[in-house]
């Protein structure tokens, strides 16, 4: 008997969709495998006879629930199929925004960049496919415990009127209100303030 | 069922125009997310372009950008293809395709009606 592939997941980040397994102990030789998808009722070949542990599916439609499954192989015997269920808008992670962040005296301007999404032309990001898309920011005084969260309205945001020659950090997540549904953070980027503009009366 | 109809089609010189067409035939293209593919001969599909509805946002593949140009006439319930600067290798038939739920723009996966294809032919 060859055994079945062990600890079958989907990773899924952004629609870039992997999945992935581990190979079982197997005392006669090295294994393969054969991963597979449910299409219009027949299992359609995705990848064969790899000896890899993962399997692209990203060009998966982005709805709908799809079954995808895999085996193990050795010479002419094979494991049961192991299935998964997996349905890309909702189960796939939202990874981190992108951010610029530039200083203008005692402010922070801020523009974030929705995720790209594997398989899509470079102009159709995570915003597209998501209409309640939003972003969270949270920014904090470098060194400090104290967290301030703010939710922008458009692509961009100025923190104002902060600390001179003070150090902040901001970091940004997508978010989607209508699913309750956060993305990663972005690694957080640290700027020091300058001079307060005001001027002197 | 949803029939899509696409014209426009034809034969041209490098460097010439055409305007492809897309047309629901006794529907409204009233759909998320309209695009253009084509499959050059020996070839599989290639995602062109697509339009948004919510947003009017267009989106173009890198062989095309500058070149083509998508748009939408609500009125007319159509869609055009505007191909500029053609060149030899455009040469392909073009599809049209409607997607229900506009979640995906490039990936012929992310559409589910199709019309049945017009040739360009770009050659001197």
């Known amino acids: 008997m060859v055994p079945p592939p062990e600890n079958v997941r989907m990773n899924s980040v952004n629609f870039k969709n992997i999945l992935q397994w581990e190979s079982p102990a197997f005392a006669k030789g090295n294994l393969t495998f054969t991963a597979q998808y449910l299409s219009y009722r027949i299992f359609q070949d995705k990848c064969m006879n790899t000896t890899l542990t993962e399997c692209d599916f990203s060009s998966l439609s982005k709805y709908g629930d799809h079954t995808l499954r895999v085996r193990a192989e050795f010479a002419d015997e094979h494991s049961d199929w192991v299935n998964i269920t997996f349905c890309p808008v909702d189960d796939t992670i939202i990874g981190p925004p992108g951010m610029q962040v530039e200083v203008l005296a005692d402010s922070l301007h801020m523009r974030f960049l929705a995720p790209k999404i594997e398989n899509e032309y470079e102009t159709w990001t995570m915003k597209n496919v998501y209409n309640s898309w939003t972003y969270n920011v949270q920014y904090w005084k470098n060194g400090t415990d104290e967290k301030f969260q703010i939710t922008p309205q458009y692509d961009f945001e100025v923190l104002r009127n902060l600390e001179p020659w003070t150090t902040y950090c901001v970091q940004v997540r997508g978010f989607l209100p209508d699913r309750n549904k956060a993305g990663e953070w972005s690694e957080p980027v640290c700027e020091q303030t300058t001079h307060d503009e005001t001027v002197p009366s | 069922e949803v029939q899509l109809v696409e014209s426009g089609g034809g034969l041209v010189q490098p460097g010439g125009s055409l305007r492809l067409s897309c047309a629901a035939s006794?529907?409204?293209?009233?759909?998320?997310?309209i695009g253009w593919f084509r499959q050059a001969p020996g070839k599989g599909l290639e995602g062109v372009s697509c339009?948004?509805?919510?947003?009017?946002?267009?989106h173009y593949a890198d062989s095309v950008k500058g070149r083509f140009t998508i748009s939408r006439d609500n009125s007319k319930n159509t869609v055009y293809l505007q191909m500029n600067s053609l060149r030899a290798e455009d040469t392909a038939v073009y599809y049209c395709?409607?997607?229900?739920?506009?979640?995906?723009?490039?990936?012929?996966?992310?559409?589910?009606?199709w019309g049945q294809g017009t040739q360009v032919t770009v050659s001197s």
């Open positions: 006794g529907n409204s293209l009233d759909y998320p997310t």
């Open positions: 395709a409607a997607s229900l739920y506009g979640l995906g723009c490039k990936s012929e996966a992310d559409y589910d009606y």
């Open positions: 339009i948004s509805a919510s947003d009017g946002s267009t």
